[in-house]
């Protein structure tokens, strides 16, 4: 790595959890002094080039599209920037995982995902997402729909023949709201995942704000009723005056 430059970013433009045979676009941060950018996959501590972009596109971030995702293409990726004949810079690494049934079928069964204490919580509360499976599982991964960052990974615990992992979201903020799924994986290939659990929607409701809205609505209704009452009184009085004359 050259000097004290910040490490360039690498990101998956969609989710880093890719369905079998799906595709993903990887973006490497443009480096002004680089004349080419290589996309490397890291397998067993060995770096292998799987893509290469020349410096044509000015300061545009080089992009790479990986099609027909499978277990061989899952793993850790890194952008390597060539800035001289023997001078390189490297990005951070990106983990891509593939989800779908493997041929051996050991990941065929989906895990289940549940939430404690409730799927609707207030900010500041503690929430636990519990991922479980009756089949052998080494690690569980938790991903949030639409999030480009890497999924959370936890080693599974064996509880009375059930494999499980507890993902703690504490304290909850509005950013935690969304749809979650969990996956099983085995240590033989940590980048290959089972099919996802059923989606779980976590609603982070700001009750203070909701109560304020409710109070505001109630006040508006009362005000409207008051206006209508005054109007009715006024109309009624006017009618009496007319009758008298």
């Amino acid at each position: 790595q050259e000097g004290d430059f910040p490490m360039p970013f690498i990101s998956a433009k969609s989710s880093p959890v890719i369905p079998l045979d799906g595709s993903v676009k990887i973006q490497c941060q443009a480096i002004r002094e680089a004349y080419l950018t290589q996309l490397m996959i890291i397998k067993n501590s060995t770096y292998r080039e799987i893509g290469r972009r020349l410096k044509f596109w000015n300061e545009t971030d080089p992009e790479f599209v990986i099609d027909h995702m499978d277990a061989n293409k899952a793993g850790r990726y890194q952008c390597q920037y060539r800035i001289g004949h023997y001078r390189f810079r490297y990005s951070d690494t990106l983990e891509l995982v593939v989800t779908g049934e493997e041929p051996a079928g050991r990941l065929r069964d989906r895990p289940s995902l549940s939430v404690r204490p409730s799927p609707s919580v207030a900010p500041g509360e503690n929430v636990t997402l519990l991922c479980q499976s009756g089949n052998r599982t080494d690690t569980f991964l938790l991903s949030k729909e639409g999030a480009a960052h890497r999924p959370l990974r936890l080693r599974s615990q064996d509880q009375d023949g059930w494999y499980q992992a507890e993902f703690s979201l504490s304290p909850v903020t509005s950013a935690h709201g969304g749809t979650y799924r969990c996956y099983r994986s085995l240590s033989t290939n940590p980048y290959l995942l089972s099919q996802p659990s059923e989606p779980l929607a976590l609603l982070v409701a700001d009750y203070t704000m909701q109560n304020l809205i409710r109070m505001g609505l109630a006040a508006s209704v009362l005000l409207l009723l008051g206006i209508l009452l005054c109007q009715a009184r006024h109309d009624h009085g006017g009618a009496r005056e007319a009758a008298r004359s």
Partner: antibody, heavy 120, light 107 residues
Framework: EVQLVESGGGLVKPGGSLKLSCAAS????????MSWVRQTPDKRLEWVAT????????YYPDNVKGRFTISRDNAKNNLYLQMSSLRSEDTAMYYC?????????????WGQGTTLTVSS | DVQITQSPSYLAASPGETITINCRAS??????LAWYQEKPGKTNMLLIY???TLQSGVPSRFSGSGSGTDFTLTISSLEPEDLAMYYC?????????FGGGTKLEIK
């Protein structure tokens, strides 16, 4: 299934103009760089033009620079090649080709081609 | 520009044989050479890129080797459907350039 279908070829007089089109289907068009490659009557292949996936940047070899313009419409999944000041040496079969998502200058899908004849 | 010289321009072989086609670059292109197959009535097919990487879906009887300036396409256990025109192309630097092609006939 990836498909590229070229159209617009024909007979043009030297100095004339013509616009070729390529209709793409079966893939996310806006993710890929697209190119035109031609095959001369003596069966040689020549790269003619490339356009970046976003449609911002274009590249040409010196022999067509200033005469040919590549463009794309990502909303319609179409690629175009506007050719002007045509010469007899531009006579060729013109292919639309998709660049792979991983390497510049590498063409993983090609169309069937459309023929341009430049002759008086 | 990088000039690519392809040889032979014509080749005839029998089914089951192994054949080789060569390409030489006018300057070093590292490993960045691709091979394409052109068959009558079909669209051009990318066989090999980066010198030796087999494109997905291509039969394993096709293989590529070489780096620097000299490269080879090998087709082992030749099959009748391998009758085609074969082209090499450098994808190291602009402008992308192709070899002159090799016409392979099956005896």
């Amino acid at each position: 299934e990836v498909q590229l279908v070229e159209s617009g070829g024909g007979l043009v007089k030297p100095g004339g103009s013509l616009k070729l089109s390529c209709a793409a289907s079966g893939f996310t068009f806006s993710n890929y760089g697209m190119s035109w490659v031609r095959q001369t009557p003596d069966k040689r292949l020549e790269w003619v033009a490339t356009m970046h996936s976003g449609g911002t940047y274009t590249y040409y070899p010196d022999n067509v620079k200033g005469r040919f313009t590549i463009s794309r419409d990502n909303a319609k999944n179409n690629l175009y090649l506007q050719m002007s000041s045509l010469r007899s040496e531009d006579t060729a079969m013109y292919y639309c080709a998709r660049e792979t998502g991983l390497y510049d200058g590498l063409f993983d899908f090609w169309g069937q081609g459309t023929t341009l004849t430049v002759s008086s | 520009d990088v000039q690519i010289t392809q040889s032979p321009s014509y080749l005839a072989a029998s089914p089951g044989e192994t054949i080789t086609i060569n390409c030489r670059a006018s300057k070093t292109i590292s490993k960045y050479l691709a091979w394409y197959q052109e068959k009558p009535g079909k669209t051009n097919m990318l066989l090999i890129y980066s010198g030796s990487t087999l494109q997905s879906g291509v039969p394993s009887r096709f293989s590529g080797s070489g780096s620097g300036t000299d490269f080879t396409l090998t087709i082992s256990s030749l099959e009748p459907e391998d009758l085609a025109m074969y082209y090499c192309q450098q994808h190291d630097e602009y402008p992308w350039t192709f070899g002159g092609g090799t016409k392979l006939e099956i005896k």
